[in-house]
């Protein structure tokens, strides 16, 4: 950066090189160039010469004043016009930053995704600070009082093997940068209560012949958790509003859920599960599309999730890939 240049003098910032966005700041430049009584001192911001708000303080020093400085980062340097020198002489340079102190971290959430081997903790960091902000996640055992600290820039994955102080913990997050420090409330957790079952996946759908045509959605999860509650939501792709069906599920076999749907309409399905009675849900599964046939089907066939299908046949949709859910992060 600009701070690595060889200086023939000194540049400094008041109140500091990192300051609160919107402040008035002063940048001072003091020349110390051999055989040079500067005729003029110049300031440059990001390589562009500044023309206003420059005050000469004495023979070697000048001040540049900014009102309501709003740029997150800027490279400043200053030069001197020396007699008998054709070019300006570089005095010194400095990188300056403006931003905000951190907000109090809130919505601290810790979950263990089944089979991951990690406890994942996230939080709402609040408004953008614009400057380097570090987070320390504190995990304190309610049984042994031992505390672990983890330094991070965003969320944290903590190996469950390192949580050796029993099952009950307090978790809190400390946010700090050059402008301040804040700390979240303490979240009390029990490791058995924060497990999110292995992802539920819709594998295929078919609409079969019956007095009233019936669509069966096939879905499964690799979870070993015995008591699991799930929700499946579905809607016509042209609709805004979801319909939701609830299930108490035993994943020892593939689940089959029946729906009576309108013919010749493209539907979208998603599923999510939680350990029964616990706090956190899986994110909604990938979007699964299925189009119902126009007429009562006669024959069984398969069609993929694209819109190609044969009118008048049993229509099957098979999951072929991951489509992004519209709100994957919904674990609350």
């Amino acid at each position: 950066g600009i701070t690595n240049i060889n200086c023939s003098g000194h540049i400094w910032v008041e109140p500091a090189t990192i300051f609160k966005m919107g402040m008035n700041i002063s940048i001072y430049c003091q020349a110390a160039i051999k055989n040079c009584q500067p005729r003029k001192l110049h300031f440059y911001k990001n390589g562009i010469k500044e023309r206003f708000q420059i005050t000469r303080i004495n023979k070697t020093t000048a001040r540049l004043w900014y009102k309501n400085f709003l740029e997150p980062h800027a490279s400043m340097y200053c030069t001197a016009e020396c007699p008998k020198h054709f070019q300006e002489t570089l005095i010194c340079g400095k990188d300056i930053s403006s931003g905000y102190p951190p907000d109090i971290p809130d919505e601290v959430t810790c979950v263990i995704y089944e089979y991951s081997g990690n406890m994942t903790c996230t939080w709402n960091a609040g408004k953008l600070t614009y400057i380097d902000t570090k987070y320390v996640v504190h995990v304190k055992s309610l049984e042994t009082e031992e505390e672990q600290q983890y330094l991070t820039s965003s969320y944290i994955n903590i190996s469950t093997d390192s949580l050796q102080g029993g099952k009950k913990y307090l978790v809190w997050v400390q946010a700090a940068n050059a402008l301040g420090m804040e700390e979240s409330k303490q979240l009390q957790i029990h490791l058995d209560d924060i497990v999110i079952p292995s992802a539920a996946v819709i594998s295929r759908a078919e609409t079969i012949n019956a007095t009233v045509p019936k669509t069966i959605i096939y879905w499964d999860s690799q979870t070993t958790i015995e008591k699991v509650s799930c929700e499946m939501r579905y809607k016509a792709t042209t609709n805004q509003t979801w319909n939701v069906k609830e299930f108490d599920t035993n994943f020892t076999y593939v689940q089959q859920s029946e729906f009576y749907l309108e013919p010749n309409i493209k539907y979208v399905f998603q599923v999510r599960c939680q350990e029964t009675g616990k706090r956190y849900w899986q994110p909604w599964s990938s979007l699964f599309f299925h189009k119902t046939p126009e007429t009562v089907p006669q024959v069984t066939s398969k069609a993929f999730q694209h819109d190609t299908w044969n009118s008048g046949l049993t229509v099957a949709s098979i999951s072929t890939g991951h489509l992004t859910s519209d709100n994957r992060g919904d674990i609350g």
């Epitope: 320390v136 304190k140 009082e145 031992e146 505390e147 600290q149 809190w172 804040e182 700390e183």
Partner: antibody
Framework: QVQLVQSGAEVKKPGSSVKVSCKAS?????????MCWVRQAPGQGLEWMGC?????????YYANWAKGRVTITADESTSTAYMELSSLRSEDTAVYYC????????????WGQGTLVTVSS | DIVMTQSPLSLPVTPGEPASISCQAS??????LAWYLQKPGQSPQLLIY???KLAAGVPDRFSGSGSGTDFTLKISRVEAEDVGVYYC??????????????FGQGTKVEIK
């Protein structure tokens, strides 16, 4: 068994600084631990000054009144913790203790013998 | 800022009789509370941690109880060697930027 041995008594002038050391033996420096400092003015109660947490990273915490005046550091190579108090005034005359449990808990099984710092003009 | 308040501040006791000291936290500190005894001219010594766990080498006439905000230290039968100043200390968290002190004011126990 953890042992904490502190530096000797000091007499200081108002406005100056003092740096008290605390050499620890018996702490597993590969584990996480807190080392804290507590002071006690003559005839007064215990007053927490601050702590240093040493683990995968180092973190320091200070009492509200101590911020800007107290600096706590640790030199793992010599197993020594330091507490520096600047801008001394007569009210800082006290016995200064380092304290730890040798782990990352905040109660103190082990205390240094105390260092008397006298601030007098 | 968590404030620790002890009562009484002075406790005259009779050897062989029970004694009790109370400590109140201004907010929930779970069971993160320690008790210390400081005898004249000595460094403090840990008696109780985690509100109710007896520290190594401490006689079992000492016991601690409580959680949340209200805590008690009991001596079942006071002995002459128990005189000194007793302090409670919150051991929940020191990372909060507003902490002033983590100790109570102290309770002076002396023989009647």
């Amino acid at each position: 068994q953890v042992q904490l041995v502190q530096s000797g008594a000091e007499v200081k002038k108002p406005g100056s600084s003092v740096k008290v050391s605390c050499k620890a033996s018996g702490i597993d420096f590969n584990s996480n631990y807190y080392m804290c400092w507590v002071r006690q003015a003559p005839g007064q109660g215990l007053e927490w000054m601050g702590c240093i947490y040493v683990g995968s990273h180092v973190n320091t915490y200070y009492a509200n009144w101590a911020k800007g005046r107290v600096t706590i550091t640790a030199d793992e190579s010599t197993s020594t913790a330091y507490m520096e108090l600047s801008s001394l005034r007569s009210e800082d005359t006290a016995v200064y203790y380092c304290a730890t449990s040798g782990s990352s808990v905040l109660y103190f099984k082990f205390w240094g013998q105390g260092t008397l710092v006298t601030v007098s003009s | 800022d968590i404030v620790m308040t002890q009562s009484p501040l002075s406790l005259p006791v009779t050897p062989g009789e029970p004694a009790s000291i109370s400590c109140q936290a201004s907010e929930n500190i779970y069971s993160f509370l320690a008790w210390y005894l400081q005898k004249p001219g000595q460094s403090p010594q840990l008696l109780i941690y985690s509100a109710s766990k007896l520290a190594a080498g401490v006689p079992d006439r000492f016991s601690g109880s409580g959680s949340g905000t209200d805590f008690t230290l009991k001596i079942s039968r006071v002995e002459a060697e128990d005189v000194g100043v007793y302090y409670c200390q919150q051991t929940n968290r020191y990372s909060n930027p507003d902490i002033y002190n983590v100790f109570g004011q102290g309770t002076k126990v002396e023989i009647k």
